[in-house]
């Protein structure tokens, strides 16, 4: 038999082998695709299934417009003017190109030594489902599962029945300073059809470094609040990707969970006391912040407060 | 929203002829076939003839081969079905429909058009 | 040329009732047979497509099986909405073939 691929929407039409160019002809045309269950015998005269499979005046069978249910075997039997049967087997495979591969949401640099996603790569409206593959500076990424990490997801429209790839790709670069250059590409594993390729989009790696400062903001400003007021402290730090963040109050660990905000609601006299944040960077070791004070001062003890006389000698209640 | 408006039907000697028209909208009529069922009165349904999306294409049952034509203008939207030595037995409702090929099998129909056929 | 044999020609049901109407094909029509529901005076409205497939805004007490050749619809709980001539058709081959007709009355 013959193996013949037809683009999905395109006409296709098979030559029944043997078959007299005009009739009077002897032929059979029967197929066996995702619209029969078995073998359809084709009626010479035509009928309903004209649309999808039409017997041509020259014995030849007419797909107007393949479709993936169109998928099958076809096989012609003829018989030629000198009285011999001929026949034609052939098995048809559909396929349909997608757009363009795009890499979205791309980051916009890279860390060495962290893991960082690089982006995603969508090809919409393949059949059959096809592969993407990630390419590093023109070459095939071959993920490892550790410094290259790739996940793939394939989703199939419950109408068309045409695929929708998506595969998000994730690296571990060794070393800053470099700028890889990252491609992606669409192959449909058909032959004589080259791979769809996406943009290339080029990254600067950059070094974890220490981070370049850590500071520690604190609300209210001065660190000076009243009993039962809210104070709030936060560990502001520029590394990437951004560390654990713990909290030391007068040199001992405060048991809470890592978080780069410390809210401290009705604060009392205890809450007094001297706090700093510690952020720990996996490739480099802990940070600690300046320390602020805090104090809780009764209203009148340092100036203006919550519902404290202001200037104008007015009562005011914030 | 899919309409089909028949219209034509009327009364008719023996041996006369009669030009059914069915106006179609609401869908992209080039690429549907089409279909003409008739219903004789207090009897079934009986198909009478279909013709492919083109136009090059037609298809008859027996009893009507040779007397009726199909046709369509994709242009106007619109399909035919010229009935010639028209005879008592061909007295009935003509109903126009969509499809007739087992892609789009008669999903939609006109609301049908009488033709008596009488002396 | 296929023939589609209808059967019962008629029945008496009432509401809430389960209703079988079956039509047999005389030769392989695979599942191109689809139901409809005619009511007096007006055009046949599609119930089921290839077979087993419900038409759009058909409520989904109408319902359709193949055996072979086989075709069933069936309507699980008779509405009064439903007492109409229901018709199936095999449109594998021309020429396209009608069943009979099976009238749903009240009893």
């Known amino acids: 038999g013959q193996n013949i691929t037809a683009r999905i929407g395109e006409p296709l039409v098979l030559s029944c082998k043997g078959a007299p160019k005009k009739p009077p002809q002897q032929l059979e045309w029967k197929l066996n695709t995702g619209r029969t269950e078995a073998w359809k015998v084709l009626s010479p005269q035509g009928g309903p299934w004209d649309s999808v499979a039409r017997i041509l005046p020259n014995g030849s069978l007419l797909l107007p417009a393949t479709g993936i249910v169109d998928e099958g075997t076809f096989r012609c039997r003829a018989t030629n003017r000198r009285g011999k049967e001929v026949k034609s087997n052939y098995r048809v495979r559909v396929y349909q190109i997608p757009g363009k591969p795009e890499i979205v949401d791309p980051a916009s640099e890279l860390t060495a030594s962290v893991p960082n996603k690089v982006g995603t790569c969508v090809s919409e409206g393949s059949y059959p489902a096809g592969t993407l593959s990630w390419h590093l500076d023109g070459k095939l990424l071959i993920p490892d599962g550790k410094e290259t990490l790739v996940k793939e997801e394939t989703r199939r429209h419950p109408e068309t029945g045409l695929f929708t790839l998506r595969s998000e790709l994730t690296v571990i670069p060794t070393q800053g300073g470099t700028h890889p250059t990252f491609s992606c590409s669409f192959s449909l594993g058909l032959p004589r059809r080259r791979p769809l390729n996406t943009a290339p989009i080029q990254l600067r790696v950059r070094e974890p470094g220490p981070p370049e400062g850590i500071q520690l903001l604190v609300e209210p400003e001065g660190g000076i609040v009243a009993p039962g007021g809210t104070v709030t402290l936060t560990c502001a730090i520029s590394a990437q990707p951004p560390p654990q963040v713990h909290w030391i109050k007068d040199g001992a660990p405060l048991p809470l969970a890592p978080s780069p905000v410390l809210l401290l609601p009705e604060v009392g006299h205890e809450d007094e006391g001297t706090y700093s944040c510690v952020a720990t960077h996996p490739s480099h070791g802990p940070q600690e912040s300046p320390p602020v004070s805090i104090r809780v001062t009764e209203t009148g003890d340092e100036g203006p407060a919550e519902g404290s006389v202001g200037e104008s000698g007015l009562g005011t209640l914030a | 929203e899919v309409q089909l408006v028949e219209s034509g039907g009327g009364l008719v000697q023996p041996g006369g002829s009669l030009r059914l028209s069915c106006a179609a909208s609401?869908?992209?009529?080039?690429?549907?076939?089409m279909t003409w069922v008739r219903q004789a009165p207090g009897k079934g349904l009986e198909w009478v003839a279909s013709?492919?999306?083109?136009?090059?294409?037609?298809y008859y049952p027996d009893s009507v081969k040779d007397r009726f034509t199909i046709s369509r203008d994709n242009a106007k939207n619109s399909l035919y079905l010229q009935m010639n030595s028209l005879r008592a037995e061909d007295t009935a409702v003509y109903y126009c429909?969509?499809?007739?090929?087992?892609?789009?099998?008669?999903?939609?129909w006109g609301q049908g058009t009488l033709v008596t056929v009488s002396s | 040329d296929i023939q589609m044999t209808q059967s019962p020609s008629s029945l008496s049901a009432s509401v809430g009732d389960r209703v079988t109407i079956t039509c047999r094909a005389s030769?392989?029509?695979?599942?191109?047979v689809n139901w409809f529901q005619q009511k007096p005076g007006k055009a046949p409205r599609r119930l089921i497509y290839?077979?087993?497939n419900l038409a759009d805004g058909v409520p989904s007490r109408f319902s359709g099986s193949r055996s072979g050749t086989d075709f069933t619809l069936t309507i699980s709980s008779l509405q009064p909405e439903d007492f109409a001539t229901y018709y199936c058709?095999?449109?594998?081959?021309?020429?396209?073939?009608f069943g009979g007709g099976t009238k749903v009355e009240i009893k």
């Open positions: 609401g869908f992209t009529f080039n690429n549907y076939w």
């Open positions: 058709l095999e449109f594998d081959e021309h020429p396209l073939t």
């Open positions: 013709i492919d999306n083109s136009g090059d294409n037609t």
């Open positions: 030769q392989d029509v695979g599942i191109y």
């Open positions: 290839r077979a087993t």
């Open positions: 429909a969509r499809g007739g090929d087992i892609l789009d099998s008669l999903p939609y």
